[in-house]
């Protein structure tokens, strides 16, 4: 795994313990909580990051309002089960044997059940809508400058291929970033849109996951872009299965 050899750290994930005990004495970094070795040349999967976060719990974040149009991460933090590749297992259960199915970004997509609940496959989240409201500024941002800056951010900071940033919409003060990535489009080595969105979400909240880097300093033509609220909507390749009771609630 590529990690800074001089001081053996993981540039892309500060929630790791790194030691020079890899093959040939190379630096090896293991995610807190799971102990899984991570590739420090790219983003760590959201599942491993959540597991690491739960191993050193902080205050649970505020819950977002649910949406009838798409899945929203409305259950807050939980300690997930990750597969050997670091992806979410399709079925998640808590300590009291309450189980539910999740999508590829770990968001619940079924009603909660018991241990008999079956989740046949991990359903891919292929469309993520990041809805931001920025703080008041002297004037509106130039749409094309804003578009270019956000695309650059996802490309350079999160290593997400530009083709997966489908659109950037802007109607002051609301910014919407659309990420799209079908199973067939994602090649080996491509950053997952779910992981990129999670890193972005943590950056926006001032909780950067990057080691040693400063926090996110978003500027459009030198003007600071300060976000005051974020909502993230997740659309799956197969629609979620909730009971009518929830849908009408």
């Amino acid at each position: 795994h590529t990690a800074a050899q001089d001081n053996c750290t993981c540039p892309t994930n500060k929630m790791t313990v790194c030691s020079p005990d890899g093959p040939g004495g190379r630096c090896q970094c293991r995610a807190l909580g799971s102990g899984m070795a991570v590739d420090c040349s790219t983003l760590t999967s959201k599942c491993l990051l959540l597991k690491a976060r739960m191993s050193a719990p902080k205050n649970a974040r505020t819950l977002v309002r649910p949406s009838e149009h798409a899945l929203v991460d409305n259950d807050g933090l939980y300690d997930p089960d990750c597969d050997p590749e670091g992806r979410f297992k399709a079925r998640q259960c808590n300590q009291t044997s309450v189980c539910w199915c999740v999508n590829s970004v770990g968001v619940r997509r079924t009603d909660k059940g018991d241990l008999s609940l079956r989740c046949d496959e991990l359903v891919r989240t292929h469309h993520i809508l990041i809805d931001l409201r920025h703080r008041p500024t002297a004037g509106a941002f130039n749409h094309s400058d804003l578009d270019a800056e956000l695309r650059r951010l996802f490309r350079e900071r999160y290593r997400l291929h530009p083709k997966f940033v489908a659109a950037v919409h802007y109607e002051q003060p609301t910014i919407q970033i659309e990420l799209r990535q079908n199973t067939s489009q994602k090649a080996a080595g491509d950053v997952d849109i779910g992981d990129a969105a999670y890193y972005f979400e943590r950056d926006i909240k001032g909780e950067s996951l990057f080691q040693g880097r400063g926090g996110l300093d978003l500027r459009v033509r030198g003007e600071p872009l300060q976000v005051e609220r974020t909502l993230i909507y997740y659309l799956d390749e197969i629609p979620p299965k909730f009971s009518m009771k929830r849908l009408t609630a």
Epitope: V17, P20, D21, P23, R30, G35, M36, D83, P84
Partner: antibody
Framework: EVQLVQSGAEVKKPGASVKVSCKAS????????INWVRQAPGQGLEWMGN????????NYNQKFKDRVTMTRDTSTSTVYMELSSLRSEDTAVYYC??????????WGQGTLVTVSS | EIVLTQSPATLSLSPGERATLSCRAS??????ISWYQQKPGQAPRLLIE???ESISGIPARFSGSGSGTDFTLTISSLEPEDFAVYYC?????????FGGGTKVEIK
């Protein structure tokens, strides 16, 4: 030469605690994980947890989480494993081991802990 | 927790014979498996890491293979000092776990 030297055998009563030490030499103490593994008489090997001496990060097997504490003293290159609320089934040989690459490359000589009333 | 199942529990062979020991993981662990030899009254000794990479000082008759969930330790020609208990161990994720062991005894 890498060496891990453990403290001597202990006899404890049920409910008591035991603290086993493991002194490392021959390598940079803070750079490598130290694992604790135990082996009950005639049984297999059981991983108890580990500690990274550089920053004292510990990770415990759920089975022992409420009873085990691993600490380190960098000034003496020593790691400690304390097991509390001892019961007869904790009678075992306790090993410390230094983790390299993918396996436990270096082992202490083992410390026999006997729990008996 | 990743469960490692070793088979057979006991292997009765004669010196000079080939020994094949199996270790099966409950889920895919890539090649994050190590093999150990343990003799009575001694600490375990690391033989193989990363499923197939030999450790310096370990005789060439010990070799490992496999990936994913199925792993094998092979001793090409048993020497008298090879009769011992052999354990596999995974380091894919915490908690690290060991197999139950295979005892290689003289027939």
């Amino acid at each position: 030469e890498v060496q891990l030297v453990q403290s001597g055998a202990e006899v404890k009563k049920p409910g008591a605690s035991v603290k086993v030490s493991c002194k490392a030499s021959g390598y940079t103490f803070t750079s490598y994980w130290i694992n604790w593994v135990r082996q009950a008489p005639g049984q297999g090997l059981e991983w108890m947890g580990n500690i990274y001496p550089s920053n004292s990060y510990t990770n415990y097997n759920q089975k022992f989480k409420d009873r085990v504490t691993m600490t380190r003293d960098t000034s003496t290159s020593t790691v400690y494993m304390e097991l509390s609320s001892l019961r007869s089934e904790d009678t075992a040989v306790y090993y410390c081991s230094s983790y390299r690459s993918d396996g436990f490359a270096y082992w202490g000589q083992g410390t026999l802990v006997t729990v008996s009333s | 927790e990743i469960v490692l199942t070793q088979s057979p529990a006991t292997l009765s062979l004669s010196p000079g014979e080939r020994a094949t020991l199996s270790c099966r993981a409950s889920q895919n662990i890539g090649t994050s498996i190590s093999w150990y030899q343990q003799k009575p009254g001694q600490a375990p000794r690391l033989l193989i890491e990363f499923a197939s990479e030999s450790i310096s000082g370990i005789p060439a008759r010990f070799s490992g293979s496999g990936s994913g969930t199925d792993f094998t330790l092979t001793i090409s020609s048993l020497e008298p000092e090879d009769f011992a208990v052999y354990y596999c161990q995974q380091s894919n994720s915490w908690p690290f776990t060991f197999g139950g062991g295979t005892k290689v005894e003289i027939k």
